[in-house]
């Protein structure tokens, strides 16, 4: 079953003047839900990991990045069906022989217990209770995230001379 | 729909101690070339724009974002064949009726001359001399970028308890 999709809000607002900067994100888009300082989208349909990554990108978001065990638990608590699995933004880097988040950081310890093989074309998904690896070509649901922190875009071309 | 909030990199360098953070990018990966503070990868194969976006994501990079006209010129100088075109990270947002970079910022002026239609499913590519729009489903080469600035990863899970 899916979590609710009510709108959510963020407390901090800032004055924004440049038109090229992104408007403040004052609430989560429809279909998304606020979980602390993130908006999360739990997909209903399924995709291979790479397509899930692309889908989040087209939504100007990222496959889920998990900060710590608390966030993992909070996210898993939103999964209401034991049989449902969701891709997250973690896969195995063959060249570096390590699990790697899509932001480039690595899992440096074994405190996150990933059940399954650590090998080429292995991607990570979460269920209600566990964290698993599976062939990245497998079709699964996925979770996109948008961070609610208000950030200034570094690249906002407004000076084409 | 609400705006989204893709993260961007920061200019300030910080001391790096945690092993889960991304190693300093001191030189460009193999096949990539350094252009000022970026590493660029000019694809050899072709893809629709969306697949190009996904490919850059899987390389932990972005479709090219162009800061100013100087950077456009520098990039075009690296294209040695007049007949070759490359997707960049700019497409038309129908809902916002504006050209939008994949980091969420907009083209706020008409100083960038895009030849072609500004309509749904229009994406932007560059050639040796010009900037064009074309149906996003068209297969073209593309350019990925990695920024050489040293940034601290916000999400680097290293405390799985």
């Amino acid at each position: 079953q899916k979590p609710s999709i009510g709108k959510c809000s963020v407390d901090i607002q800032q004055n924004r003047t440049k038109t090229t900067e992104r408007p403040d994100l004052l609430n989560c888009p429809i279909y998304w839900q606020q979980v602390q300082e993130k908006c999360l989208l739990f997909s209903h349909t399924v995709n291979p990991w790479n397509n899930s990554l692309a889908d989040c990108s087209t939504k100007e978001s990222s496959l889920l990045l998990i900060q710590d065990k608390d966030e993992l638990t909070r996210t898993q608590n939103l999964i209401h069906d034991k049989a449902i699995s969701f891709w997250i933004g973690l896969n195995f880097s063959l060249s570096e022989k390590n699990w790697k988040w899509i932001n480039g950081s690595f899992l440096s310890s074994n405190d996150l217990k990933i059940t399954g093989d650590a090998k080429e074309n292995s991607c990570v998904y979460i269920s209600q209770t566990s964290v698993y690896s599976e062939y990245c070509s497998t079709e699964m649901k996925w979770i996109c995230q948008k961070e609610l922190t208000l950030v200034r875009n570094k690249v906002s071309p407004d000076s084409w001379l | 729909q609400k705006p989204s909030i893709g993260k961007c990199s920061v200019d300030i360098q910080q001391n790096r101690t945690k092993t889960t953070e991304r190693p300093d990018l001191l030189n460009c990966p193999i096949y990539w070339q350094q252009v000022q503070e970026k590493c660029l990868l000019f694809s050899h194969t072709v893809n629709p724009w969306n697949n190009s976006l996904a490919d850059c994501s899987t390389k932990e990079s972005s479709l090219l974002l162009i800061q100013d006209k100087d950077e456009l010129t520098r990039t075009q100088n690296l294209i040695h064949d007049k007949a070759i075109s490359f997707w960049i990270g700019l497409n038309f947002s129908l809902s916002e009726k504006n050209w939008k970079w994949i980091n969420g910022s907009f083209l706020s002026s008409n100083d960038l001359k895009i030849t072609g239609d500004a309509k749904e499913n229009s994406c932007v590519y560059i050639s040796q001399t010009s900037v064009y729009s074309e149906y996003c489903s068209t297969e073209m080469k593309w350019i990925c970028q990695k920024e050489l600035t040293l940034v601290r990863n916000k999400v680097s899970p290293d405390s799985w308890l």
Epitope: K2, I5, T45, N51, W142 | -
Partner: antibody, heavy 121, light 107 residues
Framework: EVQLLESGGGLVQPGGSLRLSCAAS????????MSWVRQAPGKGLEWVSA????????YYADSVKGRFTISRDNSKNTLYLQMNSLRAEDTAVYYC??????????????WGRGTLVTVSS | DIQLTQSPSSVSASVGDRVTITCRAS??????LAWYQQKPGKAPKFLIY???ALQSGVPSRFSGSGSGTDFTLTISSLQPEDFATYYC?????????FGGGTKVEIK
Amino acid sequence: EVQLLESGGGLVQPGGSLRLSCAASGFTFERYAMSWVRQAPGKGLEWVSAISAAGGTTYYADSVKGRFTISRDNSKNTLYLQMNSLRAEDTAVYYCAKPLDSSQWADFDLWGRGTLVTVSS
Amino acid sequence: DIQLTQSPSSVSASVGDRVTITCRASQDISSWLAWYQQKPGKAPKFLIYAASALQSGVPSRFSGSGSGTDFTLTISSLQPEDFATYYCQQALVLPITFGGGTKVEIK
């Protein structure tokens, strides 16, 4: 122009087969799960089948399971419905439908005009 | 499967009337409900999703409300072009299911 265009309907005898096609244009077809929905004459809407964006996952209504097969060719921007062992109760207008959001199965913001399938001897 | 029950099955109304159609789900579907309008011989038209979000281009006289199991579609001031059949649809789980429809007729 953003559109879906079904074809392949017609008159078929009970036990016969038909293959419906739905040609998509004006949007990134390969990003979206797609569905077939049907409507018997004078009746309401009935969801028939869905397929994931990449085509590897399919679902069917119990009423057509084992007889119908949904497929897609993303290189041709086309959705298909192969209908075998057709019955009189399969007589309906068949619509293909696209969801509003690429993460969803439903919330169909784009429908084709429909193609009529008549099963009769 | 989730059953959706619409009421009334038909309603007679005049131009300018306020019309309310209800849809009841057999189990909690949160806000995963959409509404469609269909005219004879035409494909359905998407009106509302996520229970209350108005699809782009749909007139503001249409509104949706509700959550959980009980939902409402309201047409605040009926226009001649609004005479049609209206369907609710749940988007929570497969199989996707539709309500039986409500026909809005001219009084």
